[in-house]
C-alpha cells in the first residue's frame, strides 16, 4: 500500500485542462524531498514529464506545472490544452528516482462528442445569451414557429409565436424575425442556467410538412482559474463580464458551501476580514475590473466569484469568472508587523519589505482609504512629492541591499489612525498592509526640542538642542533637514555621549544642531531622531523660521512658527527647481484609483549642502557645536 | 441546502454485486463532490470512494481496500452518484452514506464534506 494518496482515475475532454492533487504523509523529508510526474511506459520505466525541481519535458512546454504545498502536505499537477495522446498511465510521486513512493494515476482523454449532423451545437457560459437560429422552407413562412426542449421523449414547448413563453423563460427567451427575411427565425434565450442546457427543436409549420432544426445548448459552469501566491504577498482578480453588463454593479465573492459572500462591491459593502487591504477598480467602460487583495492570510485560500447584478450581490443566470486561490505558507515575503501604535504627538517608524532583488526599484507609501471601493493615495515615495497636508512629517528613508525601507511619520494625530500600504514599482506581489492606531499620549513625548519658537536670524549663530531621555543612551541621535525628497543627516553634536555610560543624568542628554551662518534657505523643517544602525526609532520635529535682523528695529518675536507651518510651510519654495529625470514617478496606473501625476522638485545643489557631509566643501552651514 | 437520499442497499452472498445510487435534489449546482463513506458496527466511519468535477472533468478517488472492485460513477442532468461493488466480501457489510461538498480540500475526511444522507445498509453474508 503507497502512502501517497490521489485521484485514481482522471478523465476530460480534449482542450481541457487537468489540475491532479497528490497527497503525502506530513514528514519534514516529504515536505522538501523533489516531487514528480511521470508517464510509464511499457517497458515499466517511468519517465519523467515534470518535476518540482524545475524539469519539464518537451510535451508539457508551455502547458503544465508541478506546485508543492508543504502546508497541506499536498502537490498540484496542472496540464492545460489536453488532447488524446495524453491518455495513459502516470504516477506522482516522491523521490530523487522515480521508484520512490508514488500513486497510480490513470488519466483518460476523450474527443468533444458529436451529434447528428443536423445538430447545432451551442456552447455558452453561466449568464450569456444564447441565440438559436432556425431554418424553414417558404411554404411554413405564415406558419406557427416554436422551440420546445426535449425531456425524454415529450418536448416541452419553451416560446412560439404565439405569444406563448414557459414559465421558467419569462423575461428569459424571445422568438424573432430579422429585416425581410423569410426563411430563418431566431429566439435568444438569455441570463442562461445550468438547467437551461439540453436538447432544443425548433419548428415551423405543423404536421409532417413541419421544419424542425436540432440544437444542443450547452451551459458551461465557469472552469475557476489557478491561483498559487505566496502568504503575505497579494493577488489581483482581474474580472471582464463583457459589454452587457458595463452599467450594472460589479461584486467578488467568495464561496462558503452553497452561498457566495461578497467581499466587496461597487455599490459600497466590504467584508469587515478585507477591511484595508482591498481595492476593487474599475478598468475601462466595458465593465472591466479588477479587485486587488494584499497581505494574504491562510484563511484567504478559497473559491472566488466575480460578477455583476444590479443588487450587487451574487445572483443564478448572470455572468461570473471563478479562481480557485491557493496561499503557500512558505512565503518570500518576511514577517512584518501588521498593527504599529503611536501616541498623539508622537512618531512611528515603519519598516516595508521588498524584494531585495529590486533595491532600485521606486517604493511608495500610501493610505488606504474606505470611500466607495477603496483606493490608496500615494503619500510619499522615492521619486514622489509628499502629500499636502504631510510636509515635515513624514520621510521615506530607502536602505539599498538590505531589502526594507523605512517610513517616518511624526506629529501624529488621531486621524492618522488607518491603513497604509508599502508597495514598489517593482514585484507587485511585496506589497504590504499596516494598521497604524494613534491613541492619546497620557505623558510627554520622549524628544523634546528647545527652544520650541524657533525662529533663526539671518547672519547670525543659530543653535537647536533635542533633549532624549536615558534609555536612548546607547542609540545613535541624528539632525536632518526635511525636504520633499527625504530628510537628509546633519551634523550634530551629542552632549550626553561625554558621560560615563555608568551616570546618566536624565536632564542633561542632549544632542544640539548649530546653524552657523544662518541662511534663508535654512528656513524649514529639522527633525531630531534615534536610530540604530538602520533601524530609525523615534523622531520629533521643529520648523525653524528664518528673519532678516533689520538695523536698529527691535527683535519681534513671531507667532509660533510650528503651529503655523503645520498649516501653509509653502510660502518659501525651498526647493524649486525640477530634475528633468525625476520630473514624474511611473505609478503603476492599476493600482492606483486616483492615477495623478506625482511630481518631484528637488535641488542637487541644495540637497548637497544639508546633507551630512560634514567634511565636503559643499558650503555645509549645519556644523557640529 | 442539498439533500441526498441513499438507495439500491440489501443483502447479497459474498462474491456478488450490488449497485447503490445517490439522488441529490435542492441547491445541486453549488455541489463539487459527491462520494461515498461507510461504517461498520462498532468501527469509526471510513473513506470508500468520491467523485469530484470540474467542468467536463471528472476525478475519481477509492480507497486501497476497495481498488479494483468498486467504481463511482455519476449522471449530471439526473444528479444522481452511483457505487458499482463487485466482488463483494464479507468485511464490506456496514451502513453506506453518500456525502456531498462544496469544496474538497482531502476527499478523504469526512470533516470536509458538507451533506450527509441517511445511509443504507450493506450486508454480504459469507
Known amino acids: 500500500q503507497s502512502p501517497i494518496f490521489g485521484p485514481q482515475d482522471v478523465s476530460s475532454i480534449e482542450g481541457n485542462s487537468v489540475s491532479i492533487t497528490c497527497y503525502y504523509p506530513d514528514t519534514s523529508v516529504n515536505r522538501h524531498t523533489r516531487k514528480y510526474w511521470c508517464r510509464q511506459g511499457a517497458n515499466g520505466y517511468c519517465a519523467t514529464l515534470i518535476s518540482s525541481n524545475g524539469y519539464l519535458s518537451k510535451e508539457y512546454s508551455g502547458r503544465a506545472s508541478l506546485i508543492n504545498f508543504p502546508e497541506n502536505s499536498t502537490f498540484v499537477i496542472n496540464i492545460a490544452h489536453l488532447t488524446q495522446e495524453d491518455t495513459g498511465s502516470y504516477k506522482c510521486g516522491l523521490g530523487t528516482t522515480n521508484r520512490g513512493l508514488f500513486f497510480d494515476v490513470s488519466l483518460e482523454v476523450s474527443q468533444v462528442p458529436e451529434f447528428p449532423n443536423d445538430t447545432h451545437v451551442y456552447t455558452k457560459d453561466i449568464g450569456r445569451t444564447v441565440t438559436i437560429e432556425c431554418r424553414f422552407k417558404e411554404g411554413n413562412a405564415h406558419s406557427k414557429k416554436s422551440l420546445c426542449k426535449k425531456r425524454g421523449e415529450a418536448c416541452e414547448v419553451v416560446i412560439d409565436s404565439t405569444e406563448y413563453v414557459d414559465p421558467s423563460y419569462k423575461d428569459r427567451a424571445i422568438l424573432f424575425m430579422k429585416g425581410t427575411s423569410r426563411d430563418i427565425f431566431y429566439v435568444n434565450i438569455s441570463h442562461l442556467i445550468p438547467s437551461d442546457a439540453g436538447l432544443y427543436v425548433c419548428q415551423a409549420g405543423e404536421g409532417p410538412s413541419a421544419d424542425k432544426n436540432n440544437a444542443d445548448l450547452q451551459v458551461l459552469e465557469p472552469e475557476p482559474e489557478l491561483l498559487y501566491k505566496d502568504l503575505r504577498s497579494s493577488v489581483t482578480f482581474e474580472c471582464d463580464l463583457g459589454r452587457e453588463v458595463a452599467n450594472d454593479a460589479k461584486y467578488l465573492c467568495r464561496k462558503n458551501k452553497e452561498t457566495c459572500d461578497v467581499i466587496i462591491n461597487t455599490l459600497g459593502k466590504r467584508d469587515p476580514a478585507f477591511e484595508g487591504r482591498i481595492l476593487l477598480t474599475p478598468r475601462d467602460d466595458n465593465g472591466r475590473f479588477s479587485v486587488l487583495i494584499t497581505g494574504l492570510r491562510k484563511e484567504d485560500a478559497g473559491h472566488y466569484q466575480c460578477g455583476a447584478h444590479s443588487s450587487g450581490l451574487p445572483q443564478e443566470g448572470w455572468p461570473v469568472q471563478a479562481w480557485q486561490l491557493f496561499v503557500n505558507e512558505e512565503s518570500t515575503i518576511p514577517n512584518s508587523r501588521s498593527v504599529v501604535k503611536g501616541v498623539t504627538g508622537g512618531s512611528v517608524a515603519i519598516v516595508c519589505p521588498y524584494n531585495p532583488k529590486e533595491s532600485s526599484s521606486l517604493k511608495y507609501w500610501c493610505h488606504w482609504e474606505a470611500d466607495e471601493n477603496g483606493r490608496c493615495p500615494v503619500l510619499v515615495g522615492t521619486q514622489a512629492l509628499v502629500q499636502e497636508g504631510y510636509e515635515g512629517r513624514l520621510a521615506l528613508f530607502d536602505q539599498p541591499g538590505s531589502g526594507a525601507y523605512t517610513v517616518i511619520l511624526n506629529q501624529l494625530t488621531t486621524q492618522d489612525s488607518g491603513f497604509y500600504w508599502c508597495l514598489t514599482d517593482g514585484d507587485s506581489r511585496w506589497r504590504t498592509t499596516i494598521e497604524l492606531q494613534v491613541a492619546e499620549a497620557t505623558k510627554k513625548p520622549d524628544l523634546e526640542v528647545t527652544p520650541q519658537n524657533a525662529t533663526a536670524v539671518i547672519g547670525e549663530t543659530f543653535t537647536i538642542s533635542c533633549h532624549y531621555p536615558c534609555k536612548f543612551y546607547s542609540q545613535e541621535k541624528y539632525w536632518c533637514k526635511w525636504s520633499n525628497d527625504g530628510c537628509h543627516i546633519l551634523p550634530s553634536h551629542d552632549e550626553g555621549a561625554r558621560q560615563s555610560s555608568v551616570s546618566c543624568d536624565q536632564s542633561s542628554q542632549i544632542v544640539s544642531m548649530t546653524l552657523n551662518p544662518v541662511k534663508k534657505e535654512d528656513e524649514g523643517w529639522y527633525w531630531c531622531g534615534v536610530k540604530e544602525g538602520q533601524v530609525y526609532g523615534e523622531t520629533t520635529a521643529i520648523y525653524v523660521a528664518v528673519e532678516e535682523r533689520t538695523r536698529g528695529s527691535p527683535h519681534i518675536n513671531p507667532t509660533d512658527a510650528n503651529a503655523r507651518a503645520k498649516d501653509a510651510p509653502e510660502e518659501e519654495a525651498m526647493e524649486s527647481s525640477v530634475r528633468e529625470d525625476e520630473n514624474k514617478a511611473n505609478l503603476d496606473p492599476r493600482l492606483f484609483a486616483d492615477e495623478r501625476e506625482i511630481q518631484n522638485a528637488g535641488d542637487q545643489a541644495q540637497e548637497n549642502r544639508a546633507s551630512g557631509n560634514a567634511g565636503s566643501a559643499g558650503g555645509q552651514s549645519g556644523s557640529s557645536k | 441546502e442539498v439533500q441526498l437520499v441513499e438507495s439500491g442497499g440489501g443483502l447479497v452472498q459474498a462474491g456478488d454485486s450490488l449497485r447503490l445510487s445517490c439522488a441529490a435534489s435542492?441547491?445541486?449546482?453549488?455541489?463539487?463532490?459527491m462520494g461515498w463513506f461507510r461504517q461498520a458496527p462498532g468501527k469509526e466511519r471510513e473513506f470508500v470512494t468520491t467523485?469530484?468535477?470540474?467542468?467536463?472533468?471528472?476525478?475519481?478517488y477509492y480507497a486501497d481496500s476497495v481498488k479494483g472492485r468498486f467504481t463511482i460513477s455519476r449522471d449530471n442532468a439526473k444528479n444522481t452518484a452511483y457505487l458499482q461493488m463487485n466482488s463483494l466480501k464479507p468485511d464490506d457489510t456496514a451502513v453506506y452514506y453518500c456525502a456531498a461538498s462544496t469544496v474538497l480540500t482531502d476527499p478523504r475526511v469526512p470533516t470536509e464534506y458538507d451533506y450527509w444522507g441517511q445511509g443504507t445498509q450493506v450486508t454480504v453474508s459469507s
Open positions: 467523485i469530484t468535477w470540474s467542468g467536463p472533468t471528472n476525478y475519481k
Open positions: 435542492g441547491r445541486t449546482r453549488t455541489t463539487y463532490g
